[in-house]
């Protein structure tokens, strides 16, 4: 999906008002220095591409973050503010099925969510030059 035509300011508002709090809740009990940020992004569409990938694609050691509250809110924000996102990224019938129970939080998942926090912070500061 091409995130170029999203309403970035509206997505930023959703992040600041609610998604960020859920990410913090997920990471509670973890030191902020525990994980190094290894995933980066260069501009807002790129950041959303990376956020989408880390949030919804299963990885080794962290099978699914998609059922977490921050992920459902991310999906909702993208569905609302990115034209055509729902049609290309979400199966309508899937969206209406009952959710499965949450997976156990692993250290790998915590590391992945820590990367997500970094990507979101970068998304919110698009004018900063890449380190």
């Amino acid at each position: 999906y091409d995130f170029t035509n999203c309403d970035f300011e509206k997505i930023k508002a959703a992040y600041l008002s609610t998604i960020s709090k859920d990410l913090i809740t997920y990471m509670s009990g973890t030191k902020s220095t525990e994980f190094n940020n290894t995933v980066s992004c260069s501009n807002r569409p790129h950041c959303l591409t990376e956020i989408q990938s880390l949030t919804f694609n299963p990885t080794a050691g962290c099978a699914s973050l998609a059922k977490e509250m921050f992920a459902m809110k991310t999906k909702a924000a993208l569905a609302i503010w990115c034209p055509g996102y729902s049609e290309t990224q979400i199966n309508a019938t899937q969206a209406m099925k009952k959710r499965r129970k949450r997976k156990v939080t692993t250290n790998k998942c915590l590391e992945q969510v820590s990367q997500l926090q970094g990507l979101w912070r970068r998304f919110n500061r698009p004018l900063l030059k890449q380190q």
């Epitope: 909702a76 569905a79 609302i80 729902s86 049609e87 309508a92 209406m96």
Partner: antibody
Framework: QVQLVQSGAEVKKPGSSVKVSCKAS????????INWVRQAPGQGLEWLGV????????IYAEKFQGRVTITADTSTSTAYMELSSLRSEDTAVYYC?????????????WGQGTLVTVSS | QSALTQPPSASGSPGQSVTISCTGT?????????VSWYQQHPGKAPKLMIY???KRPSGVPDRFSGSKSGNTASLTVSGLQAEDEADYYC???????????FGGGTKLTVL
Amino acid sequence: QVQLVQSGAEVKKPGSSVKVSCKASGFTFGSYGINWVRQAPGQGLEWLGVIVPLVGVTIYAEKFQGRVTITADTSTSTAYMELSSLRSEDTAVYYCARGQEYFYWYFDLWGQGTLVTVSS
Amino acid sequence: QSALTQPPSASGSPGQSVTISCTGTSSDIGGYDRVSWYQQHPGKAPKLMIYGVSKRPSGVPDRFSGSKSGNTASLTVSGLQAEDEADYYCSSYASGHTFGLFGGGTKLTVL
């Protein structure tokens, strides 16, 4: 069962405000969109706006911007639509309608409607 | 935004097919695959019949079908039955985050 139940009919004076409620049951309220649509007597359907409680997003139709306020109370699974500065042309049946999860623009469940009459 | 354009009336005999058109612009119907159709009987709330241009919710008979070409969407009711007599409204997502831009409605009469 899965339903939206709206508050009863209202009679209002021009210039006043009306607040209509819409109580959801049988589904996860926060995950869906709650849209408000009205229908004047003998006329077509007109969209007023939507709230997606999960992310606290509200969007209003340009025509009603500044005059309509949509809110939601997730603890009671209830959405509200308040319309201010009422005029006779606002006399209509007001419906709340559920927008599908992540596809908030498809209204797959409707309330029974609330008749709002604006008359002096 | 202006309302989508629908013919005020349409009719057909039982067993026949009827197609109702809904014309918009590239900012609504033409720009998004987010067209839906609603059936409304007198004194009742509308009911979703078609969404996503051509998808049918469960419980809606397969006699109802939807399509889109350019800026025009269409609803076809085949094998008309008496209970199909109702008002039909098209709706489209429109630019500027309008979730429901409706047509003026078409009164379908089963002769």
